[in-house]
């Protein structure tokens, strides 16, 4: 069967987000992938979206991320814009209203996005073959 257009959009967004790092992609998020053995695919997507939402809600106005110049501000706005897009598309793919995120493990946002990209690429390779 054909791959969902949303999945392609997610991979595209993740490709962009992982092209470069910023000060704030080095901040930590809940690592939902550390122990996701008994989690359904939809739950994983829902929990990933929840983690991203928590991150940008918490850091959108974080002065460490916003920086001191117009260019640094633009960079942070870019990060938040792409994370919101990713969040929106992940919710669409998950089709769930809410999901718990209780893990204690942490990873950097950068590593979280890389791991998510790997998962999404694997899903894409299965649905496109």
């Amino acid at each position: 069967h054909k791959c969902d257009i949303t999945l392609q959009e997610i991979i595209k967004t993740l490709n962009s987000l992982t092209e470069q790092k910023t000060l704030c992609t080095e901040l930590t998020v809940t690592d939902i992938f550390a122990a996701s053995k008994n989690t359904t695919e939809k739950e994983t997507f829902c929990r990933a979206a929840t983690v991203l939402r928590q991150f940008y809600s918490h850091h959108e106005k974080d002065t460490r991320c916003l920086g001191a110049t117009a260019q640094q501000f633009h960079r942070h706005k870019q990060l938040i814009r792409f994370l919101k897009r990713l969040d929106r598309n992940l919710w669409g793919l998950a089709g769930l209203n809410s999901c718990p995120v209780k893990e204690a493990n942490q990873s950097t946002l950068e590593n979280f996005l890389e791991r998510l990209k790997t998962i999404m690429r694997e899903k894409y390779s299965k649905c496109s073959s």
């Epitope: 595209k12 987000l17 470069q20 910023t22 110049t69 117009a70 260019q71 990060l79």
Partner: antibody, heavy 118, light 107 residues
Framework: EVQLVESGGGLVQPGGSLRLSCAAS????????MHWVRQAPGKGLEWVVW????????TYADSVKGRFTISLDNSKNTAYLQMNSLRAEDTAVYYC???????????WGQGTLVTVSS | DIQMTQSPSSLSASVGDRVTITCKAS??????AAWYQQKPGKAPKLLIY???HRYTGVPSRFSGSGSGTDFTLTISSLQPEDFATYYC?????????FGQGTKVEIK
């Protein structure tokens, strides 16, 4: 594959005008900012202008402020550089370059030569 | 405007040499410095961004370091394809400014 292709360069007299185009492909145009950078013959790189393609907000170098105008046609994935009141010192190869998602300029066009001479 | 001063302006080196190029900003740019490589008749290529992060596909022999006002590009073992001109650039604030370039020539 990301590609930037400039066009519109040529020979123009001092005081004249020229419009350069930068056609982008292989990515979502409004996701990345766009720059124009120039290089006079045998010289180094000089940044000219930057535009936020999402908002259309430009920022110019002092050397071109009031003379050069950057604009976008998002339907054509193209950035334009309108250059008026050209001077001999504007003679250079003009490159358009995509702003990296956060830093630097990660993709560059091949450049187009602008010669201002009488 | 922030001035970026590169040194040396040119250097001669042999294949296998370790090459270091420095860039000094006229005021702090925190970590917002990038390095580009340009070959004659070609467009520049992004090598390093955010002081020390190699751009996609850039060989590991290229590394960047520094912070504040002093930045360094190091080529650990010069290869034939590395003979080119290198530019530093700050993107801390507009106007974005470049160093004057360092030409790396064959000894």
């Amino acid at each position: 594959e990301v590609q930037l292709v400039e066009s519109g360069g040529g020979l123009v007299q001092p005081g004249g005008s020229l419009r350069l185009s930068c056609a982008a492909s292989g990515y979502t145009f409004t996701d990345y900012s766009m720059h124009w950078v120039r290089q006079a013959p045998g010289k180094g790189l000089e940044w000219v202008v930057w535009i936020n393609t999402e908002t259309g907000e430009p920022t110019y170098a002092d050397s071109v402020k009031g003379r050069f105008t950057i604009s976008l046609d998002n339907s054509k994935n193209t950035a334009y550089l309108q250059m008026n009141s050209l001077r001999a010192e504007d003679t250079a190869v003009y490159y358009c370059a995509r702003g990296g998602i956060f830093y630097g300029m990660d993709y560059w066009g091949q450049g187009t030569l602008v010669t201002v001479s009488s | 405007d922030i001035q970026m001063t590169q040194s040396p302006s040119s250097l001669s080196a042999s294949v296998g040499d370790r090459v270091t190029i420095t860039c000094k900003a006229s005021q702090s740019v925190i970590n917002d410095a990038a390095w580009y490589q340009q070959k004659p008749g070609k467009a520049p290529k992004l090598l390093i961004y955010y002081t020390s992060h190699r751009y996609t596909g850039v060989p590991s022999r290229f590394s960047g370091s520094g912070s504040g006002t002093d930045f360094t590009l190091t080529i650990s073992s010069l290869q034939p394809e590395d003979f080119a001109t290198y530019y530093c650039q700050q993107d801390y604030t507009s106007p974005w400014t470049f160093g004057q370039g360092t030409k790396v020539e064959i000894k």
